[in-house]
């Protein structure tokens, strides 16, 4: 009778992460008597995947009933595959021995490769806000994909960006990979409603590329422009002076009126009006009693926007 051979018909198997891998193995004879074991890798450092005789292998099920006397099918299924399961799997026949079973014959091995989708890209912007005309950096990260080939594109409001650097790690062979990209974006005053998008395409994606977004509203600070104007003299010698605070973002703003350098009133922007571009306008007014002043009055509108150093605009009120 011919000597037992261990047949692993599949040289290679490709499986999607999360799915089940079937590793096929048959023996050509029932003799010699002894169990089958499955290993990942060869040599002394090999990893036991399944032992027919003993042990607990929760992710492994056998295709056939190995308790049946005439069974020669030793194929297994490994559930919930991850990229870390990639490797070459060997079906090994042991001969019953005392005290230990003795390795008798090994199959040629089946190489298990795993394809895994990239995680949803995460885009993060700078820690501090920046003003228009400044260049800010955004990063995009996606992890856990295999194979290594991946494309990443950056967009601002649908327009593709070209100023970015991308790295896929690790450089050498690995079970899975990560991508990291940094894009430089020049801010404009109109960017409150703008979005930066990182788009990742990979062979495993059946839909459109995965997208991560960042809203420039979280990055931009548009400083206000100030205009102080004097309204016509009202009854009882009162003058109405207004301070127009225009085109600012975010809304966080505190205004202080100074009369000849002395604080007259402080208020916080509340009932603002929003412009089409997402910036805000606000107006504050001060009633000045002209009869209380003998000399000209210097009125100053001082604005502290979003914790930045105050900006101010003055108006000289003539007392005639």
């Amino acid at each position: 009778e011919e000597e037992l051979q261990v047949i692993q018909p599949d040289k290679s198997v490709l499986v999607a992460a999360g799915e089940t891998a079937t590793l096929r193995c048959t023996a050509t004879s029932l003799i010699p008597v002894g169990p089958i074991q499955w290993f990942r890798g060869a040599g002394p450092g090999r990893e036991l995947i399944y032992n027919q005789k003993e042990g607990h292998f929760p992710r492994v099920t056998t295709v056939s009933d190995l308790t049946k006397r005439n069974n020669m099918d030793f194929s297994i299924r490994i559930g919930n595959i991850t990229p870390a399961d990639a490797g070459t799997y060997y079906c090994v026949k042991f001969r019953k021995g005392s005290p230990d079973d003795v390795e008798f014959k090994s199959g040629a091995g089946t190489e298990l490769s795993v394809r895994a989708k990239p995680s949803a890209p995460v885009v993060s912007g700078p820690a501090a806000r920046a003003t228009p005309q400044h260049t800010v950096s955004f990063t995009c990260e996606s992890h856990g994909f295999s194979p290594r080939d991946i494309t990443l594109k950056w967009f601002k409001n649908g327009n593709e960006l070209s100023d970015f650097q991308t790295n896929v790690d690790p450089v050498g062979e690995s079970v899975s990979y990560s991508i990291h990209s940094t894009a430089k974006v020049v801010l404009t005053r109109e960017d409150v409603h703008s979005q930066v998008i990182c788009e990742v395409a990979h062979v495993t994606l059946q839909g459109d590329p995965l997208r991560g977004t960042a809203n420039l509203s979280e990055t931009i600070r548009v400083p206000p422009t100030l205009e102080v104007t004097q309204q016509p003299v009202r009854a009882e010698n009162q003058v109405n002076v207004t301070c127009q605070v225009r085109k600012f973002y975010p809304q966080r703003l505190q205004l202080t009126w100074l009369e000849n350098g002395n604080v007259s009133r402080t208020e916080t922007a509340s009932t603002v009006t929003e412009n089409k571009d997402g910036t805000y306008n606000w107006m504050s007014w001060l009633l000045v009693n002209v009869s209380a002043h003998r000399d000209d009055v210097k009125l100053t509108c001082q604005v502290e926007h979003d914790g930045q150093p105050a900006v101010s605009k003055s108006h000289d009120l003539k007392v005639s």
């Epitope: 040289k11 290679s12 490709l14 499986v15 999607a16 490769s113 394809r115 194979p147 080939d149 991946i150 494309t151 395409a201 990979h202 062979v203 495993t204 994606l205 059946q206 839909g207 459109d208």
Partner: antibody, heavy 116, light 109 residues
Framework: VQLVESGGRLGQPGTPLTLSCTVS????????MGWFRQAPGKGLEYIGI?????SPYYASWVNGRFTISKTSTTMDLKMNSLRSEDTATYFC?????????????WGPGTLVTVSS | DIQMTQSPSSLSASVGDRVTITCRAS??????LAWYQQKPGKAPKLLIY???FLYSGVPSRFSGSGSGTDFTLTISSLQPEDFATYYC???????????FGQGTKVEIK
């Protein structure tokens, strides 16, 4: 799992024609689908795909001549203005579950003949 | 666009012969290559995907190898039902486009 193309017929140059691919046994919202064609006695030619979410992508030569769209159970190929060189058998196919780099299920094809 | 050059364009062989068909890409496509078999009046059938993985139900006499730009389809022992035309197909992960080779017709000697 099955794909069946329909709509192939004799068409006149300059006229539009829409082909359909009806699927069964799986959901079009889970897979990328493609259109291909093969002129008599010639090789296979890629036309375009539609993603699981419904975005079409075309071969560079298409230049707006064809439009791919889909409903829940059918994928359509609209040929805007037939030319004689469009005479071919048109196939629809589904990409494999492991990735978009290969097509594992094909329809039997539908023949389009363009002639005046 | 990537060009796929298949060779030979046709070959004559006998049952039991070992047959090798090659496919060359004009630029690297890594392992994104599939092989199809097509018989007259029929749709293509997938044989090999990702350069070397045998599609389920395909006889083990078919095998694929290669990476980068050069790929091979081998039929270890030609059977009567294998007489057909074979196509390679690439997918380019940057352009996300597909290209076919011009086909290899395997005929009975």
């Amino acid at each position: 799992v099955q794909l069946v193309e329909s709509g192939g017929r004799l068409g006149q140059p300059g006229t539009p024609l829409t082909l359909s691919c009806t699927v069964s046994g799986f959901s079009l919202s889970s897979y990328v689908m493609g259109w291909f064609r093969q002129a008599p006695g010639k090789g296979l030619e890629y036309i375009g795909i539609i993603s699981s979410s419904g975005s079409p992508y075309y071969a560079s030569w298409v230049n707006g001549r064809f439009t791919i769209s889909k409903t829940s159970t059918t994928m359509d190929l609209k040929m805007n203005s037939l030319r004689s060189e469009d005479t071919a058998t048109y196939f629809c196919a589904r990409v494999g579950p492991l990735g978009v780099d290969y097509f594992n299920i094909w329809g039997p094809g539908t023949l389009v003949t363009v002639s005046s | 666009d990537i060009q796929m050059t298949q060779s030979p364009s046709s070959l004559s062989a006998s049952v039991g012969d070992r047959v090798t068909i090659t496919c060359r890409a004009s630029q690297s496509i890594n392992s994104y290559l599939a092989w199809y078999q097509q018989k007259p009046g029929k749709a293509p059938k997938l044989l090999i995907y990702s350069a070397s993985f045998l599609y389920s139900g395909v006889p083990s006499r078919f095998s694929g190898s290669g990476s980068g730009t050069d790929f091979t389809l081998t039929i270890s022992s030609l059977q009567p039902e294998d007489f057909a035309t074979y196509y390679c197909q690439s997918w380019h992960y940057i352009s996300r486009s597909y290209t076919f080779g011009q086909g290899t017709k395997v005929e009975i000697k």
